[in-house]
């Protein structure tokens, strides 16, 4: 049990407050974490609260401002980047997103050395994607979808693609579904090591649907939206991947890396590169039915000028019982030897785990078991590797870093984490300097989240980097709810839930229930982390009980659990849902006439199918932007875990899966929808067949549609969702205002 | 035009070193690797290894390793190998040859070999 | 490495004739962009000439009654009608893996 520690005693309970629903929309009780952006073994950079960019230097214990604020300010730049050479920084201003990643900004290129902007051969504008050289001052970046490469910032560029074009060839970014669902990353270009070489891919969507939708705006017509989208079965991208040498571009120019046979036969994804010496990469590429991967390492030849990618240097990954990987295909990290690498993958007992692999796959030395998961690998260096995993207690919700000394035999495994600060810190992620000279460990709860500095070979604290203390302070006299974490155990399945229960809980009282449900594939709701949000608001100040459930589909606890839902998305997510339900009931504190659900995205679509099981456990629910059929979903996504909607493949349970065939199953119910008309992920027009299928059946319904908006509903609309689903909720639970 | 000009014809004792050049000219000589390659009297062809002059790139056959040096000599565009103790069966005509620009391993100019006898 | 063996040895043809030599290699030359053999022709006293790279590529220069065909490790080089000049001996070479070998050459003599 996690119970966040009672700051309530009888004599003050009248200066406590509970939360309101402004506190949770402007903000108040959000945290910081403290991430450096490393430069070196022992230095780091950071923006400073009045905005200069600060060095630090851990051993030496001095700091200096490397850029003022007055400069941030004079081009209005939000971003930076510093030059490896450190002679340059270029400034991101004009910020403006596209997709979850992407967005376009300005770039201004400073010099440090005479402290000014570089003129002449300025960059255009707005450029989709730049980046320094690994080493010195070489640039790269990508304006209206084509490649360029200055040797130093005041060079003229030279233009390494010509074929890029909107919507059609993208060079060295991905396009929509490639960003979204495969590298979720806002580039598709990586230097090697020492920046001899630019490997970049070229993603060609000519042949690709195109989903449309308007953008209302302020003009008299709306515009159109055009985006190629592949959909579950459609025309996929086609992916090209080149490197060049960035030396002499002009010599040979861009070489392609060939495709592994067995993945060039039928259609595929590239899935990563990863570079190991700047004369060898490796590859990653996925079948389109995504149970097999291919990892293939390319060596430079000289004398080809190209990329040699022997097929005795090609390992397969493929799994039996699910799709290959976790949410994506592991990537290696590849040891000093440049060859042997680790990586993180099913064991024979289907719990993911790190391998070192040498020669074969088949090979492979396990380095971690158990009946828990290995979850990042952070670091190897030639005496230690950092991993992450659940396996401390035995919390799947949890997670701890570890560090296993690779250059003694037999290795050694020592918890980093688990002991520091056991009661606040929980959930951990690390950021590790040039041979993990130094780390930083951020802990994200169930405490305040605290960020510490560590010394990689003693693993000592140096100095907290940021504690939260404002937050802290400002949670005195707040009543928070309390959370635990617990399982149950149904029919060999074991349910892990997270409750969130009001302030003065007791266990003798009746109490509304809110099921919040994401529920995706290799996706995680209960974790062991600190958050103030608006079901926090719910429990504090409207005395509901919410609770979060990680049914058959969620990640981190084996295949088992995992690969439970392989090819019928939508059964057994919503059945675990509803087991918990029945057994919250039984532990006697529920009432069982108000309960309610609510999700977003793919919660939004297990919500929705859950309000329409038919067991009348639910009396109102909320789904926002779900998807509604999974044929209107992207293609690397969906058939990841659903095959193809073939009638030679899944067809039948794409068909089975959808919301609109339960209809008929709303009538007992309230059910909101809500989605945003601009929702570039998961189309308005899943909520738009809702609506239609529900009229047809005669069904009523509450909706609310946000004009413009995207899957995210940011600004304003934030505030009006919360807003509106908070009366929706009260309503139901019959709460007064 | 290319062309590949080798030093004169050698006799060496057993346990001796030659040391063998190639001037190019009419290219320019840091793009392209210069390969070795040597011909026993009345026998086929046997790769030594490559050089390339733009990188300081060198490849060397395994058979040979710890015998041969390679180098070049960017201002004068030319192009050295060495082999020290020599044996009789190193008895040979020794080649350089250009690198294809894109024939990815073929050779497509050739010197006019230089003869170098192993005898005691 | 790999093992470039040709044949014939000797190929005795009369001017005119088509001549086909033959090399095979003990493992494959290609991948899925390029064949990595090449052929050359060797007059007495004079150094090798490129005749065809990468399998089929003609080198400039070279008369086309000269063309090579093969993948994997199948290679042919083909003279469709041969001229007197055509006779000496005729090596194909592998760059697929290092060290580059050379088959041990076709001796194309005059019947």
């Known amino acids: 049990i996690v119970l966040r520690p009672s700051r309530v005693h009888n004599s003050e309970e009248n200066t406590m407050r509970a939360l309101t629903l402004k506190d949770i929309l402007n903000g108040t009780f959000s945290y910081k974490t403290f991430f450096p952006n490393w430069i070196s073994g022992q230095e780091y950079l950071h923006q400073s609260a009045d905005n200069n960019i600060v060095l630090y230097n851990i051993e030496t214990g001095q700091s200096y401002t490397i850029l003022s604020n007055r400069t941030m300010k004079s081009v209005n730049a939000s971003n930076y980047g510093l030059s490896p050479d450190r002679q340059f920084v270029y400034l991101e201003s004009d910020y403006s997103k596209l997709w979850r990643y992407s967005y376009t900004a300005t770039y201004y290129i400073y010099d440090l050395s005479n402290g000014e902007f570089v003129r002449g051969n300025e960059l255009p504008r707005p450029i989709q994607y730049l980046c320094w050289s690994p080493v010195g001052s070489k640039l790269a970046y990508v304006y209206q979808n084509n490649i360029y490469l200055k040797q130093r910032p005041g060079d003229p560029p030279f233009q390494i693609t010509f074929n890029g074009r909107e919507n059609k060839i993208f060079n060295g970014i991905p396009d929509w579904v490639y960003e979204e669902e495969m590298l979720a990353t806002k580039y598709a270009l990586w230097w090697s090591p020492n920046g001899k070489f630019l490997a970049y891919a070229e993603f060609n969507d000519t042949d690709i649907p195109v989903i449309a939708y308007s953008y209302y705006g302020d003009e008299q017509y709306p515009r159109t939206i055009n985006i190629p989208y592949p959909k579950a079965g459609a025309k996929n991208p086609v992916v090209r991947i080149f490197i060049i040498d960035t030396t002499y571009p002009a010599y040979v120019g861009p070489q392609e890396v060939p495709v592994p046979a067995m993945i060039a036969s039928s259609d595929y994804y590239f899935s990563w590169l990863t570079w190991v010496t700047d004369e060898r990469v490796c590859l990653q590429w996925l079948k389109r039915v995504q149970n097999v991967s291919v990892l293939s390492i390319c060596d430079f030849r000289e004398d080809w000028q190209t990329w040699d990618c022997p097929k005795t240097q090609e390992h397969i990954e493929e799994s039996r019982t699910g799709w290959a990987g976790g949410f994506f295909v592991s990537t290696p990290v590849f040891s000093y030897d440049a060859i042997s690498y680790y990586k993180i993958f099913s064991d024979k007992d289907g719990y993911k785990h790190i391998h070192y692999i040498k020669d074969t796959v088949e090979n492979a030395i396990q380095i971690t078991s158990g009946k828990w998961e290995a979850i990042n690998i952070f670091r190897v260096t030639q005496d230690s590797l950092f991993y992450s995993s659940n396996e401390f207690e035995e919390y799947p919700g949890r997670r701890n870093i570890y560090r296993i000394s690779i250059g003694s035999y037999p290795p050694s495994k020592k918890c980093v984490t688990c002991h520091l600060r056991k009661e606040r810190c929980q959930y951990y992620t690390a950021s590790f300097s040039d041979y993990a000279k130094y780390y930083a460990l951020v802990c994200y709860g169930p405490g305040i989240p605290i960020s510490t500095l560590h010394d990689g070979r003693t693993d000592q604290e140096i100095k907290i980097l940021e504690e939260n203390k404002e937050l802290e302070n400002a949670l005195k006299n707040i009543q928070l709810p309390k959370e635990e974490i617990k399982k149950l155990e149904v029919d060999e399945i074991t349910l892990w839930y997270k409750m969130i229960l009001p302030p003065q809980f007791d266990r003798s009282k009746k109490y509304p229930l809110l099921i919040q449900v994401y529920g995706g594939p290799c996706s995680q709701s209960v974790r062991s982390v600190f958050a103030v949000n608006w079901i926090s608001y719910l429990a504090s100040k409207e005395g509901m009980v919410i609770a979060l459930v990680d049914g058959r589909g969620t990640a981190f606890q084996g295949d088992k659990l995992l690969y439970a839902v392989y090819r019928k998305l939508g059964v057994y997510e919503v059945e675990d849902q509803i087991t918990a339900v029945r057994k919250f009931i039984e532990m006697g504190f529920i009432d069982e006439k108000r309960i309610a659900i609510w999700g977003w995205s793919y919660g939004g679509y297990v919500s929705s199918l859950a309000l329409a099981s038919g067991t009348g456990l639910f009396k109102c629910g909320i789904a926002v932007a779900p998807v509604s059929s999974w044929e209107y979903y992207a293609s690397v996504y969906t058939e990841r875990f659903m095959g193809l909607p073939t009638k030679d493949d899944n067809l039948e349970h794409y068909k089975n899966s959808t919301v609109m065939a339960r209809a008929e199953y709303f009538r007992n119910v309230d059910y909101l929808l809500i989605h945003g008309t601009a929702d570039d992920n998961v189309h308005f027009q899943n909520s738009a067949q809702i609506a239609k299928a529900l009229v047809n059946a005669q069904v009523d319904f509450q909706a609310m549609w946000y004009s413009d908006q995207n899957h995210g509903l940011s600004g304003l609309s934030t505030n009006h969702l919360y807003t509106h689903m908070t009366h929706f909720l009260k309503q139901c639970f019959s709460l007064s205002d | 035009q290319v062309q590949l000009v080798q030093s004169g014809a050698e006799v060496k004792k057993p346990g001796a070193s030659v040391k063998v050049s190639c001037k190019a000219s009419g290219y320019t000589f840091t793009e392209n690797i210069i390969h070795w390659v040597r011909q026993a009297p009345g026998q086929g062809l046997e790769w030594m290894g490559w050089?390339?002059?733009?990188?300081?790139?060198?490849k060397y056959a395994q058979k040979l390793q710890g015998r041969v040096t390679m180098t070049t000599d960017t201002s004068t565009s030319t192009a050295y190998m060495e082999l020290r103790s020599l044996r009789s069966d190193d008895t040979a005509v020794y080649y350089c040859?250009?690198?294809?620009?894109?024939?990815?391993?073929?050779?497509?100019?050739w010197g006019q070999g230089t003869l170098v006898t192993v005898s005691s | 490495e790999i093992v470039l063996t040709q044949s014939p040895g000797t190929l005795s043809l009369s001017p005119g004739e088509r001549a086909t030599l033959s090399c095979r290699a003990s493992?494959?030359?290609?991948?899925?962009?390029?064949?990595?053999m090449h052929w050359y022709q060797q007059k007495p006293g004079q150094a090798p000439r490129l005749l065809i790279y990468l399998a089929s590529n003609l080198e400039s220069g070279i008369p086309d009654r000269f063309s090579g065909s093969g993948s994997g490790t199948d290679f042919t080089l083909t003279i469709s009608r041969l001229e007197p000049e055509d006779f000496a001996v005729y090596y194909c070479?592998?760059?697929?893996?290092?060290?580059?070998?050379f088959g041990q050459g076709t001796k194309l003599e005059i019947k």
């Open positions: 050089i390339h002059p733009g990188s300081g790139s060198i």
């Open positions: 070479q592998q760059s697929r893996e290092l060290p580059y070998t």
């Open positions: 493992q494959s030359v290609s991948t899925s962009a390029y064949s990595y």
């Open positions: 040859a250009r690198h294809a620009g894109t024939g990815r391993g073929a050779m497509d100019y």
